[in-house]
């Protein structure tokens, strides 16, 4: 009687387990054929690649930029895999010799044949931006702008790509694309969650990151404030990106680039200097240089304080003091007279900061060779080490830096003020808010700056609405299927077990 | 579209000062300079002066130097030309028109009609 | 001052037919390959026009029967074919120079 009974629970155990095993394995069979098959496209991979120039005021860039074609609406796909500095000056310095211009262009024009294969040449399109320097060249002279555009645009079409045309873009789009990049970058127009991060500076939340971008000749800054409402319209973006919609303030304050912000400086000193000598703090201590009074008017950006000299020529001799050159960079911002509520400087509308930013080109440049990107380091200690760059002497500073060029090198006093000038009383960050400025050079191998995100516009890689993309996060798909897999991998071990040795397995079940 | 609207026509007596105001819109105000061009009736376009909208600075015609002031109100998109010390032959239509070196745009005139 | 000089002082064309005005600068108007020559329309009670810029450029939206040649000093409007519209006062001006400065102006009419 006790030998049937442990036969019949034998038998039903048996029947069970094999029951429930069969099941697992059937549904993980099916798992991982319904996450394979819906995650994968049974397509080769077909790299696509675009080229954007920026065409600055102090010099040229190249961008190579390449994606996977069937992830064209995906988020963070992009991504840059050359840049390519010109050999020279900005564009808007080529006014006087434009049949120079083919030159110019062709070793960085040349570097992107190379790399991007011939195969795809026709259908690479490349676009060039001109910014602040060709605004300022247009401003003078609409004639002369057209002039260099259409040299320029004439040297590009002579390549084997698809060139899309050549354009001063507003300060507006500088700043708008400026802050697509890195928010683009940083993956902050992903809806999904993230278990995890490889990207610096991200923090889990989808706020995105203001930008702040400094040029020679203009400087931006760009963020989505808390206040939706806007009292200057001419600031106010929207746009709807992956289904999801961004109120942006942005604004370019042409003329406060570093390149031209010291020539202001250097008009605005120079009409109360006695003789045509210019004791400037700006400078280091020994250092001496001569400046054309045309040279100082050619900008419009010194207009405003032009006046009849009774000397052609002034030399600099730097004294090196921070706290005088700060006072002096702080006479360049008008903050007496606001219209709004709040403004930056020079009656301009600035609504109140919100969030983090990523400041990069000559923000991240500069405050990198004065080894002060660091997050670790408080606006107090920035202050303390400026004061201490700038006074070092010129002739100590040259040994130093001896591989950095002496025109540059000069300069980092008076941009280093200049920036922490332009953060702290322009734009309004305090002590406090300056660990909310992130310095980026570049976002997991893309530079940050303009140039992506008009890329991104202009070839419609940023849809309005959330793309019907892979369900599933490569991070979840892997780890679905290794779960799925490792059911599958036990099923069939205890399947084993059970019908190879069923004594060893029932031993104990009486 | 670029638009520039000027303010209403103006009777002034010898001696007075006028103020001529030039709306911009349709582009960035601070993009492009702004020139004043004034024709009194019969006569040839003359060219007064510009201001650098971005920072107020300006550049005049001798003939006027002294008698004319060029500002703006970059909040409100606004030039304005002022005339001083105003004379019968001062009587004409005075333009606003945007441009570095070339005047593409132009507003509809103001009459101003110097008369004692 | 670049003094301009425009000639005719007036023109008579029958409808159809080609109208030349003629502006000379007092100097050269040419500047790093630019010629800083633009030409205008001014019908009565409206604001100039503009044509022709940098000598031979045309302005948005002018017809093609409007042409512009010349550099240095020497510079010429051609309306290829008149039209009852095209009367007018045409005004050459220079910008390569502070003070800007205008041609005396040409007066079309139809013959």
């Known amino acids: 009687m006790e030998d049937t009974k442990e036969s019949n629970v034998k038998t039903f155990c048996s029947k069970n387990i094999l029951a429930i095993l069969g099941f697992s394995s059937i549904i993980a069979v099916i798992a991982l054929l319904a996450v394979g098959l819906t995650q994968n496209k049974a397509l080769p991979e077909n790299i696509k690649y675009g080229i954007v120039l920026d065409a600055g005021s102090s010099h040229t860039s190249l961008y190579i930029y390449k994606w996977p074609a069937e992830k064209e609406n995906d988020t963070g796909v992009v991504h840059q895999v050359e840049e390519c500095r010109v050999k020279g000056p900005g564009i808007s310095k080529y006014v006087q010799k434009v049949n120079e211009i083919g030159i110019y262009l062709t070793d960085c024009m040349e570097r992107a044949r190379e790399v991007i294969p011939r195969s795809q040449h026709q259908e690479t399109p490349v676009y060039l931006g001109a910014t602040a320097g060709m605004r300022l060249l247009r401003m003078e002279s609409e004639e002369l702008a057209d002039r260099v555009l259409d040299v320029v645009e004439r040297s590009l079409s002579n390549y084997p790509f698809d060139f899309q045309g050549a354009r001063i873009i507003t300060g507006q789009e500088e700043g708008a694309y400026g802050w697509i990049t890195i928010n683009y970058l940083l993956g902050k127009f992903s809806q999904k969650t993230r278990w995890f991060s490889i990207v610096p500076y991200e923090t889990n939340n989808q706020e995105t990151f203001g930008a702040l971008d400094l040029g020679g000749a203009s400087t931006q800054i760009t963020f989505v404030p808390q206040n939706q409402t806007t009292e200057s319209p001419d600031n106010a973006l929207q746009f709807r990106l992956y289904g999801k919609d961004y109120n942006v303030y942005t604004h370019s304050f042409l003329c406060y680039g570093k390149d031209q912000a010291l020539w202001q400086k250097l008009a605005k000193d120079i009409q109360v200097a006695s003789n045509e000598i210019l004791r400037d703090p700006c400078f280091h201590p020994g250092y001496k240089k001569v400046v054309n009074v045309s040279d100082l008017y050619k900008t419009p950006c010194t207009k405003r304080f032009e006046m009849t000299l009774p000397f052609q020529q002034f030399e600099i001799q730097g004294i090196g003091n921070y706290q005088q050159c700060h006072q002096s960079v702080l006479e360049l911002f008008n903050t007496s007279y606001c219209p709004y509520s709040q403004c930056a400087f020079n009656g301009i509308f600035l609504p109140p900061l919100q969030g983090d930013f990523g400041a990069f080109s000559a923000f991240y440049f500069v405050m990198n060779f004065l080894n002060l990107t660091s997050e670790k380091v408080s606006q107090e200690k920035v202050t303390e080490m400026m004061k201490k760059f700038c006074s070092q002497p010129w002739e100590e500073i040259k040994t130093s830096y001896a591989g950095v060029k002496e025109k540059y090198l000069s300069e980092y006093c008076f941009s280093g003020t200049y920036i922490l000038s332009l953060l702290l009383q322009g734009y309004h960050f305090t002590a406090d808010s300056w660990e909310h400025i992130h310095f980026i050079g570049k976002i997991q191998g893309s530079d940050a700056g303009w140039t992506l995100g008009y890329m991104l516009n202009l070839t419609n890689m940023i849809p309005a609405e959330q793309p019907l993309s892979t369900p599933l996060s490569h991070s979840t798909y892997v780890f679905l299927m290794v779960l799925f897999s490792l059911v599958l991998v036990i099923v069939a071990i205890i399947g084993l077990l059970i019908f190879h040795k069923p004594s060893y397995f029932w031993k104990d079940m009486v | 579209q670029v638009q520039l609207v000027q303010s209403g026509a103006e009777v002034k007596k010898p001696g007075a000062s006028v103020k001529v105001s030039c709306k911009a819109s349709g582009y960035t105000f601070t993009d492009y300079n702004m020139h004043w061009v004034r024709q009194a009736p019969g006569q040839r376009l003359e060219w007064m002066g510009y201001?650098?909208?971005?920072?107020?600075?300006?550049t005049f015609n001798q003939k006027f130097k002294g008698r004319v002031t060029i500002t703006r109100d970059t909040s409100a998109s606004t030039a304005y030309m002022e005339l001083s010390s105003l004379r019968s032959e001062d009587t004409a239509v005075y333009y606003c028109?945007?441009?570095?070196?070339?005047?593409?745009?132009w507003g509809q005139g103001t009459l101003v009609t110097v008369s004692s | 001052d670049i003094v301009m000089t425009q000639s005719p002082d007036s023109l008579a064309v029958s409808l159809g037919e080609r109208a030349t005005i003629n502006c000379r600068a007092s100097e050269s108007v040419d500047n790093f390959g630019v010629s800083f020559m633009y030409w205008y329309q001014q019908k009565p009670g409206q604001p100039p026009k503009l044509l022709i810029y940098g000598a031979s450029n045309q302005g948005s939206g002018v017809p093609d029967r409007f042409s512009g040649s010349g550099s240095g000093t020497d510079f010429t409007l051609t309306i290829s074919s008149l039209q009852a519209e095209d009367v007018a006062v045409y005004y050459c001006q220079q910008t390569k120079e502070v003070p800007y400065t205008f041609g005396g102006g040409t007066k079309v009419e139809i013959k």
């Open positions: 201001i650098v909208p971005l920072n107020g600075g300006s």
């Open positions: 028109a945007r441009g570095g070196t070339r005047f593409a745009y």
